[in-house]
Amino acid sequence: HTAAQDNCTCPTNKMTVCSPDGPGGRCQCRALGSGMAVDCSTLTSKCLLLKARMSAPKNARTLVRPSEHALVDNDGLYDPDCDPEGRFKARQCNQTSVCWCVNSVGVRRTDKGDLSLRCDELVRTHHILIDLRHRPTAGAFNHSDLDAELRRLFRERYRLHPKFVAAVHYEQPTIQIELRQNTSQKAAGDVDIGDAAYYFERDIKGESLFQGRGGLDLRVRGEPLQVERTLIYYLDEIPPKFSMKRLT
């Protein structure tokens, strides 16, 4: 099994309980909250991680302007319903029977309704814009070095295929990382950009999801890159459906 066999832990997800009692006595790790078996050789889905978190005892511009359809996660934490593969179910409801539709990263994309609300399909978030502001430094980072370091981070730490890191923009002190992944581009075994973005977000906040690893120590040519603000925008393959009332 892909959980560390010697001491039976899950390197990629500390929100698990691991025991050497899977099939054939192999190490098996289950996500807290849901109890779903997870593959510890890759990132755990954001839906299972959120569920585990809820169960735990909480001018000339080079920068991208988020589209009018971009979503920001204003609703924050909730206890999601995940499907048998660990993905978000298209419709989420709370304990008081208030329901809403979400995209593949679990962000609300419709007005809230009641139990009669229909969410026909899980709409894929195909473009994620991670907007960071770094703390003041002696000088600006070299753009190429910054680009290379962030691409290396997503490739090595989050196992995201380099082709899904579409661009890294820099205009001191703002850094923007663009992740793009269409349904047709994502092959079996590929890390989802939504999961990579969530792991990155938690790392930046000093809440690493990796087992036993130190926190994220981002350096560009030896100079620490310390983030003081993060904003993440999500763009879906089908634009969200909010009433005009919300947009005003």
């Epitope: 309980v17 025991s19 050497p20 009692d21 899977g22 099939p23 098996q28 289950r30 807290l32 909250g33 849901s34 109890g35 779903m36 078996a37 499907d83 048998p84 593969e85």
Partner: antibody, heavy 117, light 107 residues
Framework: QVQLQQPGAELVRPGASVNLSCKAS????????INWVKQRPGQGLEWIGN????????NYNQKFKDTATLTVDKSSSTAYMQLSSPTSEDSAVYFC??????????WGQGTLVTVSA | DILLTQSPAILSVSPGEKVSFSCRAS??????IHWYQQRTNGSPRLLIE???ESISGIPSRFSGSGSGTDFTLTINSVESEDIADYYC?????????FGGGTKLEIK
Amino acid sequence: QVQLQQPGAELVRPGASVNLSCKASGYTFTSYWINWVKQRPGQGLEWIGNIYPSNSYTNYNQKFKDTATLTVDKSSSTAYMQLSSPTSEDSAVYFCSSYRSDGFAYWGQGTLVTVSA
Amino acid sequence: DILLTQSPAILSVSPGEKVSFSCRASQNIGTSIHWYQQRTNGSPRLLIEFASESISGIPSRFSGSGSGTDFTLTINSVESEDIADYYCQQSNSWPFTFGGGTKLEIK
């Protein structure tokens, strides 16, 4: 060989709590989940919850969250389930099972709990 | 919670016959299904794990199949000692759940 020993019967007054035991032997107690299952007379099996003895992590079927409390004593390789404020609905056979987090390969003989004044 | 529906509630067969028990899950659970036999006043006994994997010490006449939502336990030549209740159980996610059971009777 693996054994899970449970007392045969417990008589409890309504409202009084009862602590059911399950003593494990023949394997490394801390490495394997202990599951608890309820069976009312003539009825099917109902999963109450489980506990991982190594770190005492517990899960409960929502239906039993307020009445059952699972604990372990690693020093004696014993798992416990406390039933609080039992009613006649809690009169049943309670099984502990272990060894796998998936299929439950080993079972105790079950404890018949009778709630009666 | 994942609901497991077993059918039929009672099966009546003659010794030597082949018999099949059905278990249907309310959602896709891969092969995370396990089958148990429980004789009168006894503890359940694991017969098959992960839909089709045999268990040491269980007679070879017991076999399992299926994946996703539909699962089957088969006894290819029933013996009188097989009179019991048969339950399926899922381990895809917590809370684990059991089917309602099927009672096997011998004609």
